[in-house]
């Protein structure tokens, strides 16, 4: 393993995560670790001199930056709250306030908005999709032989009770919004009117 600064033929350093090519001196030099920045650029004889980020600033990755990024508060106006404070090697960790969910742009949560809970009416249920973050619930009717009797964003349609399995008989048929009503069978020898 070569120790920076070292010369290289093809401008590709051995450890590209922790080293970078410095074209002015045609050498590979050390990057600064997270939480630090470049205080003095390397030369052919001396490696990079790093310094800890000043108070209220940070660098998250191995870098050859001449400054650190300014710490930012979590933005209440956009619906965020702080989970963990900013440190020299990590920006403040923010999340959506309760009852709010992320609006994403290029895989980044750019702001939060209140969750719009669509209530599926009796006789319907929320359509199952792969979109976990989808707040626009689509309500679909219960399949035949199933019912759902609440106004709910999450309730599922259940199969109608089968009276005969319980040794009972049907008193009233099930609908999409109510279960079958069962009753005891008539006593043997009782008159059927």
């Amino acid at each position: 393993q070569l120790v920076p600064p070292y010369r290289i033929e093809n401008q590709t350093c051995w450890d590209q995560d922790k080293e970078y090519y410095e074209p002015m001196h045609d050498v590979c030099c050390s990057r600064c670790p997270p939480g630090e920045f470049v205080f003095a650029v390397c030369s052919r004889s001396q490696d990079t001199v790093c310094k800890t980020c000043p108070h209220n600033s940070y660098n998250e990755h191995w870098n050859h930056l001449s400054t650190c990024q300014l710490c930012r508060p979590c933005d209440i106006v956009l619906g965020f709250e702080e989970v963990a404070p900013c440190t020299s090697d990590r920006k403040a960790e923010c999340r959506c306030q309760p009852g709010m969910s992320c609006v994403y742009l290029d895989n980044e949560c750019v702001h939060c908005e209140e969750e719009r809970l669509v209530l599926c009416q009796p006789g319907t249920e929320a359509e199952v999709t792969d979109e976990i973050m989808d707040t626009d619930v689509n309500c679909v009717p219960c399949k035949p032989g199933h019912f759902q009797n609440t106004s709910s964003p999450r309730a599922r349609c259940q199969p109608h009770t089968r009276c005969e399995i319980q040794g009972l008989v049907e008193a009233a048929p099930g609908t999409s919004y109510s279960d079958t009503i069962c009753k005891n069978p008539p006593e043997p020898g009782a008159m059927l009117l």
């Epitope: 300014l70 508060p73 209440i76 106006v77 009852g99």
Partner: antibody, heavy 120, light 106 residues
Framework: EVQLQQYGAELGKPGTSVKLSCKVS????????IHWVIQRPGKGLEWIGR????????ISTEKFKNKATLTADLSSNTAYMQLSQLKSDDTAIYFC?????????????WGQGTLVTVSS | DIQMTQSPSQLSASVGDRVTLSCKAS??????LNWYQQKLGEAPRLLIY???ILQTGIPSRFSGSGSGTDYTLTISSLQPEDAATYFC????????FGSGTKLEMK
């Protein structure tokens, strides 16, 4: 200690503009959002909007969208609010207040306010 | 938009009284509430943040409580210097102030 300096009073004629300043000392405004709050004579406090001084991004309430323009200058650690098309009901005290890394969800520091009087 | 309603709008009380001010949100704000005191001709001063946490330097006679939509600021033993207007402020999904309660001395 965080301190915010605002000029005490500004006089503006109807239809013109005024630019209010809020100079912060003891804290880098790059680590804050700067908020502006209005208080009309004898009335309550109303949030106008805020600026992110690092990139100039602003968010304002609908009623101030075409009234207030928020800017900031990192080099002088100062935030500004320009009020345009002044009308008599813009007569009010305007406060600036930062949310900071240690107080991200409350206004622990306030400027003393600038009284804007609109009169011909 | 979430509305913040304070009551009463005005209140007169005597030195030593226990005083309770109310702030009601139009929907759940999850305890994301601050209280400010403003005296005539001055900027507001933060008293309590996050419903019940006393800001540094504020006397312990001030306390806050509440949850959901209903919040309270209590002054356990009123002092002459407490004559002021008190504002609640929600910080759930942005900032909104209540209309204020003006507290006067009898």
């Amino acid at each position: 200690e965080v301190q915010l300096q605002q000029y005490g009073a500004e006089l503006g004629k109807p239809g013109t503009s005024v630019k209010l300043s809020c100079k912060v000392s003891g804290y880098n405004i790059g680590n804050t959002y700067i908020h502006w709050v209005i208080q009309r004579p004898g009335k309550g406090l109303e949030w106008i909007g805020r600026i992110d001084p690092t990139n100039g991004n602003t968010i304002s309430t609908e009623k101030f969208k075409n009234k207030a323009t928020l800017t900031a200058d990192l080099s002088s650690n100062t935030a500004y609010m320009q009020l345009s098309q002044l009308k008599s009901d813009d007569t009010a005290i305007y406060f600036c207040a930062p949310t900071t890394l240690t107080t991200p969800d409350s206004f622990a520091y306030w400027g003393q306010g600038t009284l804007v009087t609109v009169s011909s | 938009d979430i509305q913040m309603t304070q009551s009463p709008s005005q209140l007169s009380a005597s030195v030593g009284d226990r005083v309770t001010l109310s702030c009601k949100a139009s929907q759940n704000i999850y305890k994301y509430l601050n209280w400010y005191q403003q005296k005539l001709g001055e900027a507001p001063r933060l008293l309590i943040y996050s419903t019940n946490i006393l800001q540094t330097g504020i006397p312990s006679r001030f306390s806050g409580s509440g949850s959901g939509t209903d919040y309270t600021l209590t002054i356990s033993s009123l002092q002459p210097e407490d004559a002021a207007t008190y504002f609640c402020q929600k910080y759930y999904s942005g900032f909104t102030f209540g209309s204020g309660t003006k507290l006067e001395m009898k």
